[in-house]
Interface confidence: low
Amino acid sequence: DTHKSEVAHRFKDLGEEHFKGLVLVAFSQYLQQCPFEEHVKLVNEVTEFAKTCVADESAENCDKSLHTLFGDKLCTVATLRETYGEMADCCAKQEPERNECFLQHKDDNPNLPPLVRPEVDVMCTAFHDNEATFLKKYLYEVARRHPYFYAPELLFFAARYKAAFAECCQAADKAACLLPKLDELRDEGKASSAKQRLKCASLQKFGDRAFKAWAVARLSQKFPKAEFAEVSKLVTDLTKVHTECCHGDLLECADDRADLAKYMCENQDSISSKLKECCDKPLLEKSHCLAEVENDEMPADLPSLAADYVESKDVCKNYAEAKDVFLGMFLYEYARRHPDYSVMLLLRLAKAYEATLEKCCAAADPHECYAKVFDEFQPLVEEPQNLVKQNCELFEQLGEYKFQNALLVRYTKKVPQVSTPTLVEVSRNLGKVGAKCCKLPEAKRMPCAEDYLSVVLNRLCVLHEKTPVSEKVTKCCTESLVNRRPCFSALELDEAYVPKAFNAETFTFHADMCTLSEKEKQVKKQTALVELVKHKPKATKEQLKGVMDNFAAFVEKCCKADDKEACFAEEGPKFVAASQAALA
């Protein structure tokens, strides 16, 4: 349905509060270096303009597309050239090329200072002084650091942020109330950002067919009682929502997401028995709840898949008739029967099935050729099962920190060319899979672990794309979305790598080490570990463990000393010498 004024249509649908929030997020995700005040000014100008269009849809410029209006506004920023360099050239382009250009300049790793959390009293004062500005600042700071954050979900995070301050700033012990809530929001926010980044990478790098396949598998696991046509409708709508958000069309995305939530709640009976409690909630909470809803129970009487997909003489005819529909139905039927499989495994099975049909349907006796296709699935299923089993055993044996260290060593040996901060960040996150998934019952471990690893490895891929240094990483990241994790798992020690020269500066530490938080201390030690492996890629586990134990002892000793700096100055060179000898 067309509207005379798109901006008026969205303003009316979303309401002023959400409209302003989404425009602020959109601008902050595009111009990540601009000061807060500049963005607020731009948002207010757009909002005032939108109101004139609501009053009179025929007013001047109200018929322009949102990309044209927003792009024109962004291109009024005076410091565009000096702040963003070649991004300013986008402004010389016409739509839709201009928006594509802005999208290409989004920076996954912007050079922004880490957010420092002020004292609780300072935050509460700021919250009470000007609640609106306080919440806008939150949207701005998160959006500019996470340029692909799912915008309507960020509004939900902001609502929870506001609720936390409203409750805790009145509490007797403000800090005890507020800090755990802020920690939870921070951790959930990072996870949400990374999950959305994978969705956008899937759409942008592999196309909407890849995203739709992912969505068919995931929704079929969640809604195993729903008919295939129902799942297909949800997949189509969900693909539209995420295509819009990943493309910077945040108003349309939020509007369509609200429509999808409404549809799901109006059609619960044909989707899932689990939606009821979500549907009583207000919009932002409802959409979040629906996205996170647990899997419905599987229907009791599902017949064997073999009849339709192996034993039937008509497999090739049905496949030829409508390949994507037939494969989609196969994926739906397989996924609804296997909530215990990761989505990525299900997609690999569908890919293997497709490859078999492509080969066999051209053979002299197709049925004979594809008769054993399900047997070919066994090794594909066993590979992630074994991987999860082995890694959970290792996690239980070592604990999180040492498990992360084992992964740091493993991944540095695989791809030593990758920057140390990236290896530390990615390996630390890979290591979190243990605490997240290994405690779960067997049937939930694989979907938890492998689908989480896909999210973390996507972060490696987007960071590596910005500064490519390893052909092996490029290959694993670009060849196949569903085989990324097996591709990385299969990498061995890079024999072609020339070890990094030893640099004593890298292993020189100071008294400031003692005032760091436990997490920051771990990162320092893990940075040193990566550098050690880059220096000696063939070092054994025992050698590396010895050096790291010495390191921990050296830091602990100096942090207990009266003159800490003198201790680091004296003991540091001894530690370096001993480490070099141990690794020789």
Partner: nanobody
């Protein structure tokens, strides 16, 4: 909302005929192959017959071949099953499904063949 509503069932004597209909709504009917499935008391679902999206290709289970005919009218979004020479073993709840799935997504219509 995806809906499949079957009708046309009833009590009939052996050798008699019935015509079942399945009215579809909430999805692009003309884009999907459709099937008839039946479930006899105390038994699992049994696939009966299927038809492709265009209505040109039909398939039948051995047990009903030559007696039942599947057809569709895409303009009316309706699937049909013409059942002739009915036998007592045809007694079951008959329901239509999207594609070749034998998973039940609707209430079905009861067919009883008895003298």
């Amino acid at each position: 909302q995806v809906q499949l509503v079957e009708s046309g069932g009833g009590l009939v004597q052996p050798g008699g005929s019935l015509r079942l209909s399945c009215a579809a709504s909430g999805f692009t009917f003309g884009s999907f192959g459709m099937s008839w499935v039946r479930q006899a008391p105390g038994k699992g679902p049994e696939w009966v017959s299927a038809i492709d999206s265009g209505g040109t290709d039909t398939r039948y289970a051995e047990s009903i071949k030559g007696r039942f005919t599947i057809s569709r009218d895409n303009a009316k979004k309706t699937l049909y099953l013409q059942m002739n020479s009915l036998k007592p073993e045809d007694t079951a709840v008959y329901y239509c499904t999207i594609g070749q799935s034998t998973s039940r997504g609707s209430q079905g219509t009861q067919v009883t063949v008895s003298s």
